[in-house]
């Protein structure tokens, strides 16, 4: 996925990674010996964050618009290495595929497992959260699942806006040239839904819909 | 150690609102479900609402929904409970209390003190 | 919904001695996982219920040993070995199966 290319553009930055950035560095002039406890840093960011009105939060936005207009310029003109024809273009204004139930609930309770046993692996981590999925009476999961629901319908209306607009010209021409079998196609179509939930997991949750579903 | 404290009870009448309000401290807020529990002058208890950690996903019983709003401020470390068009009938004493869920089988572990709703002309 | 019975409604107990309350479910508490979707909680006078027994068996922290929770499906019983003037009070079951539903309550209450 142009991992070790150098030449790939540089993933864009979200306003709350700004902000975060900032903190770094007004920290570093504050402070340029002392040695950063990285989740009591990342605590503090995220309550200063919380408690920044609109027009403060201002600032980071336009930077984060900036680098999204400057990710998008140098990915039209950006051509993976041989090697990587395998995957392909993603537009970054194309719909974001809708997280799952299973996977919203992991996105209340990852931080709990995490904070709970410091030393875990990903893995570890993740196999507490699906015991705990497997462990939640129906009734429990059905707001997840309610939720999931209210996602994806909005996705499918989305994509569907979308894909009657037209793709952008690079995504035509398309980076993969050959004519997938169904079952290859369906199999990146997974690969790539995976990819997204990695994505969303990665991004601060700043602007978390708060939508109350009632059971 | 964990501590839950309720406010905002008091008399109101038949068709008012109270919002309740209940402090959390001594662990990580934002990483619990909550929820409000109440029980009526020498009645037994009953499940009121419940809220997830992000506050995202709220959940009531049909005795409330439409009228009771259950919502979270984690970086104050607050649960709430707007109550609209009370009844006579919601008059009790309201707890909040945290759910620990023990991979995923959930119980209210802690407790608050409690504070008393009375909907009265 | 899950209705939730509790017997009998007031129990007259000697300090010392055995006592026991029952809950049935209108319907099983049983989980696919094989644990039971029950807690009990103890609520003295004067004061905020607090956690007993969750899971149908498991003591809460700090618990004393002469409590012990028993059962499965859709009857528990909640067992004192002897009881101590300090359990006195109102006890609920609980079930989190559906939604969250309690028992009316026994009162214990010393003899």
């Known amino acids: 996925m142009g991992k070790g290319d150098p030449k790939k553009p540089r993933g864009k930055m979200s306003s709350y990674a700004f902000f975060v950035q900032t903190c770094r560095e007004e920290h570093k002039k504050k402070h340029p010996d002392a040695s950063v406890n990285f989740s009591e840093f990342s605590k503090k960011c995220s309550e200063r964050w919380k408690t920044m009105s609109a027009k403060e939060k201002g600032k980071f936005e336009d930077m984060a618009k900036a680098d999204k207009a400057r990710y998008e310029r140098e990915m039209k003109t950006y051509i993976p290495p041989k090697g990587e024809t395998k995957k392909k273009f993603k537009d970054p204004n194309a719909p974001k595929r809708p997280p799952s139930a299973f996977f919203l609930f992991c996105s209340e309770y990852r931080p709990k497992i995490k904070g709970e046993h410091p030393g875990l692996s990903i893995g570890d981590v993740a196999k507490k959260l699906g015991e705990m999925w497997n462990n939640t009476a129906a009734d429990d999961k059905q707001p997840y699942e309610k939720k999931a629901a209210k996602l994806k319908e909005k996705y499918e209306k989305d994509i569907a806006a979308y894909r009657a607009k037209g793709k952008p010209d690079a995504a035509k021409k398309g980076v993969v040239k050959a004519e997938k079998s169904k079952k290859k196609k369906e199999e990146e179509e997974d690969e790539e839904d995976e990819e997204d939930e990695e994505e969303e997991e990665d991004e601060e949750d700043e602007d978390e819909e708060e939508d109350d579903d009632d059971e | 150690e964990v501590q839950l404290l309720e406010s905002g009870g008091g008399l109101v009448q038949p068709g008012g609102s109270l919002r309740l309000s209940c402090a959390a401290s001594g662990f990580t807020f934002s990483w619990y479900k909550m929820v409000w529990v109440r029980q009526a002058p020498g009645k037994g208890l009953e499940w009121v609402s419940s809220i997830v950690p992000s506050g995202g996903i709220t959940i009531y019983a049909d005795s409330v929904k439409g009228r009771f709003t259950i919502s979270r401020d984690n970086s104050k470390n607050t649960l709430y409970l707007q109550m609209n068009s009370l009844r006579a009938e919601d008059t009790a004493v309201y707890y909040c209390a945290r759910v620990q869920q023990w991979l995923g089988r959930p119980y209210f572990d802690y407790w608050g003190q409690g504070t008393l709703v009375t909907v009265s002309s | 919904d899950i209705q939730m019975t509790q017997s009998p409604l007031s129990l007259p107990v000697t300090p010392g001695e055995p006592a026991s309350i029952s809950c049935r479910s209108s319907?099983?508490?049983?989980?696919?996982?094989?644990?039971?979707?029950l807690d009990w909680y103890l609520q003295r006078p004067g004061q905020s219920p607090q956690l007993l027994i969750y899971s149908g068996s498991n003591r809460a922290s700090g618990v004393p040993d002469r409590f012990s929770g028993s059962g499965s499906g859709t009857d528990f019983t909640l067992k004192i070995s002897r009881v101590e003037a300090e359990d006195v009070g109102v006890y609920y079951c609980m079930q989190s199966l559906q939604s969250r539903t309690f028992g009316q309550g026994t009162k214990v209450e010393i003899k």
């Open positions: 319907q099983s508490l049983l989980h696919g996982n094989g644990y039971n979707y």
